[in-house]
């Protein structure tokens, strides 16, 4: 079958990284610069996307494979394809609509993105608090008094940090 | 907070040329693409093409060159498009819409543009 | 250019029925955006890169997909998801967007 239709269709031989050429007798002609073609037999190559403003440039543009970009410093990437690039907030901040805004008391965010939270509830584990929580940190949850005990231990984990999936609409 | 704002409504003749302007604010102008987009009434959404205003670089649909062209003006944040020797099939509402790799959420108003004799 | 198709081109749902709605692409690209339009509005962003939900969408939206075929899904219909939904294609320039797909509520 390839060679069927490789005899019918001379683009079919053109290789990724080349065009074929309908100006030039359907030869192969190599991707002019600042484009690609990732698969064989193409009649046009495709324009290179460019690393611009809040992105930068993280695997350049080759003849056979689109650019792929990041985020400049500052910024961080939502979505697994980095298609956005979202403003990176301080520790014990969020980003709103407004810009990055303190989290509210009771909350708060170790990162530099994502949403403030709120301080774990010891009471509700039956804990008592044994370091207060701030805008940057979680509370540490520390055993009750009646826990106490040699060897028991006195701390326990903050709650994970979660993903927020947030965008920046 | 981030805002688009395009330009009011136009009624031209054919065969006549218009501007349409997006007045951006609450972000960095050039650190960001602007698109164009058409929507004839009752259809489907078409892209036109995209300038970064930071140095003016801009992609094309092919469909539309020779009849957009797009500019942008970094000192009034403001991105244009011009549609040249226009047509009925011009007749649409064209949207602006802040570009990252995408088109990222942030979209203008409209403006209806008629093409009528 | 890359060609998005989406179906159906018509539907329509009664409150909290699940709706699922699908974009074909002519050839394989990473990521697709949803959108949502209503009558006299501009297109809002539901979800990017596939499957990543935007700022403010109910968590009834959810997207998913790879390689050619893509689908947007609604897990219980509600009277305001009445509208247009559009997939759209930034991978490779032009960027495209599907035909769309009007839900109407029962």
């Known amino acids: 079958f390839e060679r069927t239709r490789s005899l019918q269709d001379p683009c079919s031989n053109c290789p990724a990284g080349t065009f074929c050429d309908n100006n030039r007798n359907q030869i192969c002609s190599p991707c002019p610069p600042n484009s690609f073609s990732s698969a064989g037999g193409q009649r046009t190559c495709d324009i290179c996307r460019q690393c611009k403003g809040v992105f930068r440039t993280r695997k350049e543009c080759s003849s056979t494979s689109n650019a792929e970009c990041d985020c400049t410093p500052g910024f961080h990437c939502l979505g697994a394809g980095c298609s956005m690039c979202e403003q990176d907030c301080k520790q014990g901040q969020e980003l709103t609509k407004k810009g990055c805004k303190d989290c509210c008391f009771g909350t708060f965010n170790d990162q530099k993105r994502g949403i403030c939270r709120p301080w774990t509830n010891c009471s509700l584990d039956g804990k008592s608090v044994l370091v207060n929580g701030t805008k940057e940190r979680d509370v540490v949850c520390g055993p009750s008094p009646a826990d106490l005990s040699p060897g028991a231990s006195s701390v326990t984990p903050p709650a994970p940090a979660r993903e927020p999936g947030h965008s920046p609409q | 907070e981030v805002k688009l704002v395009e330009s009011g409504a136009e009624l031209v003749r054919p065969g006549s040329s218009v501007k349409i302007s997006c007045k951006a604010s609450g972000y960095a102008f050039s650190l960001y693409w602007m698109n164009w987009v058409k929507q004839r009434p009752g259809q489907g959404l078409e892209w036109i093409g995209q300038?970064?205003?930071?140095?003016?670089?801009?992609n094309y649909n092919g469909k539309f060159k020779g009849k957009a062209t797009l500019t942008a003006d970094k000192s009034s944040s403001t991105a244009y498009m011009q549609l040249s020797s226009l047509t009925s099939e011009d007749s649409a509402v064209y949207f602006c819409?802040?570009?990252?790799?995408?088109?990222?959420?942030?979209w203008g108003q409209g403006t209806t543009l008629t093409v009528s004799s | 250019q890359i060609v998005l198709t989406q179906s159906p081109a018509i539907m329509s749902a009664s409150p909290g029925e699940k709706v699922t709605m699908t974009c074909s692409a002519s050839?394989?690209?990473?990521?697709i955006y949803w959108y949502q339009q209503k009558p006299g509005s501009s297109p809002r962003l539901l979800i990017y890169?596939?499957?990543n939900l935007a700022s403010g969408v109910p968590v009834r939206f959810s997207g998913s997909g790879s390689g050619t075929s893509y689908s947007l899904t609604i897990s219980r219909m509600e009277a305001e998801d009445a509208a247009t939904y559009y997939c759209q294609q930034w991978n490779i320039y032009p960027y495209t967007f599907g035909g769309g797909t009007k839900l109407e509520i029962k």
């Open positions: 819409a802040r570009g990252q790799l995408g088109l990222d959420g942030y």
């Open positions: 050839s394989s690209v990473s990521y």
């Open positions: 890169d596939t499957s």
């Open positions: 300038i970064y205003p930071g140095d003016g670089y801009t």
